[in-house]
C-alpha cells in the first residue's frame, strides 16, 4: 500500500480541515487507512480520522479542528495498520479554503436593477468574517457565451446589477464564491446557483 499523491489539506479556519490524497491503486480508504493528527508539540493529544473514498484511489478525511490560531501546526500521519505510509505537517492558517457563501437570493430593486444578496459564512467574531471578498458569476442559461464575472471587494455580501446589462427575457443563473486575501486562501467552493428571469416590468420579488 503506497501513497501516490501526498495529502493536500485545507482549513475553513473555524471548525474543519479536510485532507485529500491519492493511493497508488484502488483502496477501501475507511477499511485500510487511518489519518492521525495532533498539534505539533510534545505531549499533545493524538486524534484519528477515518477517511472516505472520493474515487477508487482517492481518499478524503474531514478533521474537526476548532479554534485555530495562526501559529498552530498539525502533524499528520497516514497509517495502513501498523505501517506508516506518509508523515507531514500542516499549518491551517497557511492553507485556508473559506466556507461557501450561503443563501444567494435575487431581488428586484429600484431603477431597473437586480439586487443579489448572500450570507457571509462566518460569524462576526471569526477572523475571516471581515476578510472575505467575493466573486459572482452570472450566466445566461441558454447562451454559454453570455456570462459575466463580478469581483465584490467591499464588505457587504451584495451586488447590484443593472437589468439592462443582461438580455431581456432571458433566464440567468448566479453563483458566488469567497476568498480571504490576507490569508492568501484558495477560493471557496461555488454556492448553489439561483436562477431568475431578466425582465424590466413588473418588479416583483423572486
Amino acid at each position: 500500500v503506497k501513497v501516490l499523491h501526498e495529502p493536500s489539506c485545507f482549513s475553513d479556519y473555524i471548525s474543519t480541515s479536510v485532507c485529500q490524497w491519492k493511493m497508488d491503486h484502488p483502496t477501501n480508504c475507511s477499511a485500510e487507512l487511518r489519518l492521525s493528527y495532533q498539534l505539533d508539540f510534545m505531549g499533545s493529544e493524538n486524534h484519528t480520522c477515518v477517511p472516505e473514498n472520493r474515487e477508487d484511489s482517492v481518499c478524503v478525511c474531514s478533521m474537526p479542528i476548532d479554534d485555530a490560531v495562526e501559529a498552530d501546526v498539525y502533524q499528520l500521519d497516514l497509517w495502513a495498520g501498523q505501517q506508516l505510509l506518509w508523515s507531514g505537517s500542516f499549518q491551517p492558517s497557511k492553507h485556508v479554503k473559506p466556507r461557501t457563501p450561503g443563501n444567494l437570493t435575487v431581488y428586484p430593486n429600484i431603477s431597473h436593477t437586480w439586487l443579489l444578496m448572500w450570507t457571509n459564512p462566518y460569524p462576526t467574531e471569526n477572523h475571516l468574517h471581515s476578510e472575505l471578498t467575493y466573486m459572482v458569476n452570472v450566466s445566461n442559461d441558454n447562451d454559454p457565451e453570455d456570462f459575466k464575472v463580478y469581483n465584490v471587494t467591499y464588505m457587504g455580501p451584495t451586488l447590484r446589477l443593472a437589468a439592462s446589462t443582461l438580455k431581456s427575457g432571458a433566464s440567468y443563473s448566479a453563483r458566488v464564491r469567497a476568498w480571504a486575501q490576507t490569508y492568501n486562501s484558495t477560493w471557496s467552493d461555488w454556492s448553489p446557483s439561483t436562477t431568475w428571469l431578466n425582465y424590466y416590468e413588473p418588479w416583483e420579488q423572486h
Partner: antibody, heavy 122, light 107 residues
Framework: EVKLVESGGGLVQPGGSLKLSCVAS????????MHWVRQTPEKRLEWVAY????????YYPDTEKGRFTISRDNAKNTLYLQMSRLKSEDTAMYYC???????????????WGTGTTVTVSS | DIQMTQSPASLSASVGETVTITCRAS??????LAWYQQKQGKSPQLLVY???TLAEGVPSRFSGSGSGTQFSLKINSLQPEDFGSYYC?????????VGVGTKLELK
C-alpha cells in the same frame, strides 16, 4: 553559515547508554524536521530517527524502536538522541541531518552535521 | 522496506572523463530519489533530489535521471574534487533507505 555540530559520542560498553547532541546555527531550527543518520564502519548509511518541527512526532526504523529516543529543544536550537541498550552493531559515525520539506516525501537531507563517533565495545 | 542497489561498487576514471553511476529500487519509487557525494573524512553532501533536481550550489556537470525503479547519476568532465563515494537514497515511503555506495577513484 548553515551549520550542524554533533557531540556526545565516545566508547561505551554493550548494554550501556549514551546521549548525543546536535547544535544548529545559521537557520531557523524550529522550521525544520530533523533526523539522525549513522554511517557504519563499512560505510553504509542508515536512517536512525526522525522528529517533527515542534517535537510532537517521532519515528524510528523497526530495528531501533524502544532503544533510541530523539528529542529537540527549539529554544536551544538543539537536537538530541538518547541511545540505550547499545549493541556492537550500533558502532558508527552519527550525523544529525535536516530535511527541507513539510512531509516524508522530502526526507532527503540537505544539511548534515560533522558527525560524532560512537563505539560500542567491551 | 525498499531496497536500493547501486552499481558499480567502485570505478576508476581520469580527470576529464564522463562517468555514470546507476541505482535500482526494489519497487516503484516514481521520482523520489536523492544522490549524495561523500569525500574521505567528510560528511555526505546532497547533490540531487527528486531524481533530477540539482541541489543548491552543485555544478552543472552533475545530472540525475530516471524514474520508477531505474536511476542514474552522470558526471561530465570529471574534476579532481569529484572523486569520493556516491550514494543513492529513496525518499518515497518510510523508512528511507540508502544504497551501499559507489566509490569513484582516480585512475
Amino acid at each position: 553559515e548553515v551549520k550542524l555540530v554533533e557531540s556526545g559520542g565516545g566508547l561505551v560498553q554493550p548494554g550501556g547508554s549514551l546521549k548525543l547532541s546536535c547544535v544548529a546555527s545559521g537557520f531557523t531550527f524550529s522550521d525544520y524536521h530533523m533526523h539522525w543518520v549513522r554511517q557504519t564502519p563499512e560505510k553504509r548509511l542508515e536512517w536512525v530517527a526522525y522528529i517533527s518541527k515542534g517535537g510532537g512526532s517521532t519515528y524510528y526504523p523497526d530495528t531501533e524502536k524502544g532503544r533510541f529516543t530523539i528529542s529537540r529543544d527549539n529554544a536551544k536550537n538543539t537536537l538530541y538522541l538518547q541511545m540505550s541498550r547499545l549493541k556492537s552493531e550500533d558502532t558508527a559515525m552519527y550525523y544529525c541531518a535536516r530535511s527541507p520539506g513539510p512531509s516524508s516525501f522530502y526526507w532527503y537531507f540537505d544539511v548534515w552535521g560533522t558527525g560524532t563517533t560512537v563505539t560500542v565495545s567491551s | 522496506d525498499i531496497q536500493m542497489t547501486q552499481s558499480p561498487a567502485s570505478l576508476s576514471a581520469s580527470v576529464g572523463e564522463t562517468v555514470t553511476i546507476t541505482c535500482r529500487a526494489s519497487e516503484n519509487i516514481y521520482s523520489y530519489l536523492a544522490w549524495y557525494q561523500q569525500k574521505q573524512g567528510k560528511s555526505p553532501q546532497l547533490l540531487v533530489y527528486n531524481a533530477k533536481t540539482l541541489a543548491e550550489g552543485v555544478p552543472s556537470r552533475f545530472s540525475g535521471s530516471g524514474s520508477g525503479t531505474q536511476f542514474s547519476l552522470k558526471i561530465n568532465s570529471l574534476q579532481p574534487e569529484d572523486f569520493g563515494s556516491y550514494y543513492c537514497q529513496h525518499h518515497y515511503g518510510i523508512p528511507v533507505t540508502v544504497g551501499v555506495g559507489t566509490k569513484l577513484e582516480l585512475k
